[in-house]
Amino acid sequence: FKVATPYSLYVCPEGQNVTLTCRLLGPVDKGHDVTFYKTWYRSSRGEVQTCSERRPIRQLTFQDLHLHHGGHQAAQTSHDLAQRHGLESASDHHGNFSITMRNLTLLDSGLYCCLVVEIRHHHSEHRVHGAMELQVQTGKDAPSNCVVYPSSSQDSEQIT
């Protein structure tokens, strides 16, 4: 399987909310002995590779923000902790999973990574990640709403 990032760049005004999204693609083993662990974290372009460094998102670690389930079951973080930090991660039946960040500040700018771990018991873990950039802007040059740039081309879309 692979992880796709529909948008590689999100440009948002301060105070706006944004939902960063990843999508699980390809054949997903729905067997009883396969489970998935999905999470989010901040990173950098990488000492070893992009997303190899794991930093907290608003002081919450990848452990705090994880989703867990088998196959394509829906899941959502029920953590009061995440919601207190203006964060919520969720997953649907179609392989999409996301993190919503509320009331953005300039400090939220940076590289964000989604991580999917396919756990094949008796074999090994298979890790795949996706990366996307968030730019939070303020002042007269800031957009009125979030503008997202698709990964495949530089055509932008405005999210209202």
Epitope: E47, H68, H121
Partner: antibody, heavy 117, light 107 residues
């Protein structure tokens, strides 16, 4: 704050079955691997196996024929059974939480098990 | 199974000195390697995961590096509480395996 506590007999006779339980407190047993690791006196660490919260297990091939790990989510406990023990199984036995794509981040304090007649 | 070889077996240093510990894998483990500290009579404590990510609450004097088969744990300036045994552990394949340990002792 999640804490782990091992319990069980400290002395087991050769050829018998070693049975230990690990109680998880202060957090959920969901979404992690729950492992057993042992350390013979003065030696290094050996991973015995894990049970995932879903009930799936994975054992070290060197011990697989003798090991059973089970979980009781209602009690937030997981257990180790090691059959046909010998003196070579004398060790400190640790239970630990293992995070997918990470490492053993929380350990019990360990319990010494001596195999002797 | 993947064999991890740690060197040196013992490192004799004084407080304030820099400690460099090595872990070599019998085959590539990518960057899926962790480091633990263990003091006498205590359980191991996670220091580093994925070669260089510090675990929660670990001081900045501990740093990890490397990928593939060769890894290093560096303690930039030894504090009295850092004298202990250090283990590396791989997680690219099961069974999970540990190195034999490096003892950092006071010179």
């Amino acid at each position: 704050q999640v804490q782990l506590q091992e319990s069980g007999p400290g002395l087991v006779k050769p050829s018998e079955t070693l049975s230990l339980t690990c109680t998880v407190s202060g957090g959920s047993i969901s979404s992690y691997y729950w492992s057993w690791i042992r350390q013979p006196p003065g030696k290094g660490l050996e991973w015995i196996g894990y049970i995932y919260y879903s009930g799936s297990t994975n054992y070290n091939p060197s011990l697989k024929s003798r090991v059973t790990i089970s979980v009781d989510t209602s009690k937030s406990q997981f257990s180790l059974k090691l059959s046909s023990v010998t003196a070579a199984d004398t060790a400190v036995y640790y239970c630990a939480r293992d995070i997918p794509a990470s490492a053993f981040d929380i350990w019990g304090q360990g319990t010494m098990v001596i195999v002797s007649s | 199974e993947i064999v991890l070889t740690q060197s040196p077996a013992t490192l004799s240093l004084s407080p304030g000195e820099r400690a460099t510990l090595s872990c070599r894998a019998s085959q590539s483990v990518s960057y899926y390697l962790a480091w633990y500290q263990q003091k006498p009579g205590q359980a191991p404590r996670l220091l580093i995961y994925d070669a260089f990510n510090r675990a929660t609450g670990i001081p900045a004097r501990f740093s990890g590096s490397g990928s593939g088969t060769d890894f290093t744990l560096t303690i930039s300036s030894l504090e009295p509480e850092d004298f202990a045994v250090y283990y590396c552990q791989q997680r690219i394949n099961w069974p999970l395996t540990f190195g034999g340990g490096t003892k950092v002792e006071i010179k």
